[in-house]
């Protein structure tokens, strides 16, 4: 359960991949598209509002061997729009929504090596936001395998 409905803190940051490609957001036909692309040097990076929430994760409820406190985030590149996991389509989409936000908009923030982070779906443990064919997608990660998993690593720069 997410403790409280207001974030513990918020920050603006640009989002890029492990390979330094930028995550950009473009308005097309009244809906937003998400792109993973090499930015031209002079082009300004898109910023995302990261809202941090504390969350209690009782293992007895989830049965996934995870317990204790976690940091959760929501990501909003523009007012009233949030990144959301579409678990059926294995996709990451931008949706306009009102608060309280749906569970699909919450991601467990993971600390990773190389000054990177990962975003795990609250609604689907073990599934992370990742890069597939120059788009964001949902990728299942098996902790028992040595994946290297660069495609789920992201850099946040303020």
């Amino acid at each position: 359960s997410i403790t409280g409905i207001s974030p513990i803190t918020e920050s603006l940051a640009s989002l890029s991949t492990y390979n330094d490609q930028s995550i950009t957001f473009a308005l097309e036909d009244e809906s937003y598209e998400i792109y993973v692309e090499d930015l031209k040097k002079d082009k300004k990076k898109d910023k995302v509002l990261l809202s941090y929430y504390e969350s209690q994760h009782p293992s007895s409820e989830s049965g996934d061997g995870v317990d204790g406190k976690m940091l959760m985030v929501t990501l909003s590149p523009t007012k009233d729009f949030w990144l959301q996991a579409n678990n059926k389509e294995h996709s990451v989409e931008l949706h306009k929504c009102e608060k309280p936000l749906p569970d699909q908009a919450f991601f467990v923030l993971h600390n990773r090596s190389f000054n990177c982070v990962s975003f795990e779906c609250k609604t689907d443990p073990g599934v992370f936001i990742g890069v597939k064919d120059n788009h964001l997608a949902l990728i299942k990660v098996d902790y028992s395998e040595n994946l290297g998993s660069e495609n789920i690593l992201f850099k946040l720069s303020e």
């Epitope: 920050s11 941090y52 293992s59 996934d64 317990d67 940091l71 902790y143 994946l147």
Partner: antibody, heavy 121, light 111 residues
Framework: EVKLEESGGGLVQPGGSMKLSCVAS????????MNWVRQSPEKGLEWVAE??????????DYAESVKGRFTISRDDSKNSVYLQMNNLRAEDTGIYYC????????????WGAGTTVTVSS | DIVLTQSPASLAVSLGQRATISCRAS??????????MNWFQQKPGQSPKLLIY???NQGSGVPARFSGSGSGTDFSLNIHPLEEDDAAMYFC?????????FGGGTKLEIK
């Protein structure tokens, strides 16, 4: 119940070796970064070493004071983390704690009871 | 390395009153907009227990009497109202980057 249990401490002569073990229970071990921290009256609490996950090639980090002498390792199939300590010095004396980070690996959340290492002739 | 300076080294506070412990970092412990400062309580013969993480958030099972605040380089732990059971050593620690360092500790006594 989430639990960490250290063992392997004891008395060792300067220049000697010792291997500490920590067995975890009550959680899915391979999802968490593990650390060793030591405590002595002289130096207080001192972070020693960290080992991360299989999916990031078990990245390891060490305090400068133990680099080249201590090795951290883990065996996810045995829910265990180890600290191999070589060329021990008097200043390595202290209580050694095994620590699990929180889910997401941002902070130290669960500490074991500790095992005492005494380096003395 | 980030050096954490805790003050005071010891303090004695009356039951029911407020105890405030400070921790100053030699450089900012903020990253991604989060302050990676944590507080631990240690009683004699026991291992440290997480009280506060990310500057102001309570660890599991920690009473609301314990609160943390601050950002950047200056942080504080507040305990109010103080109870008998709060007599202990308190440590700050940062988890921004390796090496993770701890403050020297504050011994809290109940008057």
């Amino acid at each position: 119940e989430v639990k960490l249990e250290e063992s392997g401490g004891g008395l060792v002569q300067p220049g000697g070796s010792m291997k500490l073990s920590c067995v975890a229970s009550g959680f899915t071990f391979n999802k968490f970064w593990m650390n060793w921290v030591r405590q002595s009256p002289e130096k207080g609490l001192e972070w020693v070493a960290e080992i991360r996950l299989n999916s990031i090639n078990y990245v390891k980090d060490y305090a400068e004071s133990v680099k080249g002498r201590f090795t951290i390792s883990r065996d996810d199939s045995k829910n265990s983390v180890y600290l191999q300590m070589n060329n021990l010095r008097a200043e390595d004396t202290g209580i050694y704690y095994c620590i699990r980070r929180n889910y997401g690996n941002w902070f130290f959340e669960i500490w074991g009871a500790g095992t005492t290492v005494t380096v003395s002739s | 390395d980030i050096v954490l300076t805790q003050s005071p080294a010891s303090l004695a506070v009356s039951l029911g009153q407020r105890a405030t412990i400070s921790c100053r970092a030699s450089e900012s412990v903020d990253r991604y907009g989060i302050s990676f400062m944590n507080w631990f309580q240690q009683k004699p013969g026991q291992s440290p227990k997480l009280l506060i993480y990310a500057a102001s958030n309570q660890g599991s099972g920690v009473p609301a009497r314990f609160s943390g605040s601050g950002s950047g380089t200056d942080f504080s732990l507040n305990i109010h109202p103080l109870e008998e059971d709060d007599a202990a050593m308190y440590f700050c620690q940062h988890s921004k980057e390796v090496p993770y360092t701890f403050g020297g500790g504050t011994k809290l006594e109940i008057k």
